[in-house]
């Protein structure tokens, strides 16, 4: 096991280039952001803790035809240690809370850059 | 259910213009992607490009010149241009839909038959 | 772009035995740990039809008969054991890098 965010995480977390490298791809999208993102696409929001990769990625798939998260999508897959399809939800849900996709990636962006400033990424 | 379905004038003639509808039923486009894909007869198929449920396009680089790729929400339509046909332009054009992540062509229209001749 | 060159070009295939397709990329058509390489089966005047997604995932619906392998730049699709039905030509396509791309295509006779 690994330790991510102070939760036991089971499966690979990313390492630090990874970690950067989606922090960078986050960061890029919000910055680049004209139109609403993915067309203001709603989404679950999710807990930021244990398994974080998977939730976000099981709320993101759900997300077609957004070619802004494409790359996230890929990223968030690769660090994920199972597979996940659209329609798939977990407990790391949170289920009564949806919100935009450009909400979702900002949380999701000042949570990485927490865990990248305290070294959680091994 | 997901429906796709091609129309087109089924005879070109050379150095004009081709423009073929892709009528869509059962989804959103502002949702989804939609591929051009083609089909010379008795030969394989050939990606042309595509429109994002976003609206971005991809193309073909081969034909990225003389393609055009855009659509109407909400009319459900998706429109293809592709200019200067040529002979070898003649084929099968099918538009197709993309799944969910990791966007692989799920669902197909039947396809809409164009010969380009004078 | 992204070459992919699918061989052999053309099969036949005993029923109840097994059917090897390979596609070949010219680069590398992985990604964070995936493979964005698809497998789809067209049968004479009929759309293409997917079979196997990221190089060895079933698509619903689709039978076990029918497995893909391969990463990176080599791949293969398997049909064992082939029955009658599977008479069609297969395509590779990929949509990592670039423009998508389609596999020549690989047809299937049943002896």
């Known amino acids: 096991l690994t330790c991510l965010g102070g939760f036991a995480s089971p499966g690979p977390v990313p390492p630090s280039t990874a970690l950067r490298e989606l922090i960078e791809e986050l960061v890029n999208i919000t910055q680049n952001q004209k139109a609403p993102l993915c067309n203001g696409s709603m989404v679950w929001s999710i807990n930021l803790t244990a398994g974080m990769y998977c939730a976000a990625l099981e709320s993101l798939i759900n997300v077609s035809g957004c070619s802004a998260i494409e790359k996230t999508q890929r990223m968030l897959s690769g660090f994920c240690p199972h597979k996940v399809s659209a329609g798939q939800f977990s407990s790391l849900h949170v289920r009564d809370t949806k919100i935009e996709v450009a909400q979702f990636v900002k949380d999701l962006l000042l949570h990485l850059k927490k865990l990248f400033r305290e070294g959680q990424f091994n | 259910q997901v429906q796709l379905k091609e129309s087109g004038p089924g005879l070109v003639a050379p150095s004009q213009s081709l423009s073929i509808t892709c009528t869509v039923s059962g989804f959103s486009l502002t949702g989804h992607n939609i591929n051009w894909v083609r089909q010379p007869p008795g030969k394989g198929l050939e990606w042309l490009g595509m429109?994002?449920?976003?609206?971005?396009?991809d193309f073909n680089s081969a034909l990225k010149s003389r393609l055009s790729i855009s659509k109407d929400n909400s009319k459900s339509q998706v429109f293809l241009k592709l200019n200067s046909l040529q002979t070898d332009d003649t084929a099968r054009y099918y538009c197709a839909r993309d799944g969910y992540y990791p966007y692989a062509i799920k669902f197909w229209g039947q396809g809409t038959s164009v010969t380009v001749s004078s | 772009h992204i070459v992919l060159t699918q061989s052999p070009a053309s099969l036949a295939v005993s029923l109840g035995q097994r059917a090897t397709i390979s596609c070949r990329a010219s680069?590398?058509?992985?990604?964070?740990?995936?493979?964005?390489l698809h497998w789809y089966q067209q049968k004479p005047g009929q759309p293409p039809k997917l079979l196997i997604y990221?190089?060895?995932k079933l698509e619903s619906g689709v039978p076990a008969r029918f497995s893909g392998s391969g990463s990176r730049t080599d791949f293969t699709l398997t049909i064992d054991p082939v029955e009658a039905d599977d008479a069609a030509t297969y395509y590779c396509q990929q949509n990592n890098e670039g423009p998508r791309t389609f596999g020549g295509g690989s047809k299937l006779e049943i002896k």
């Open positions: 680069e590398t058509v992985d990604s964070y740990g995936s493979s964005f």
């Open positions: 990221l190089a060895s």
């Open positions: 429109i994002w449920g976003d609206g971005n396009t």
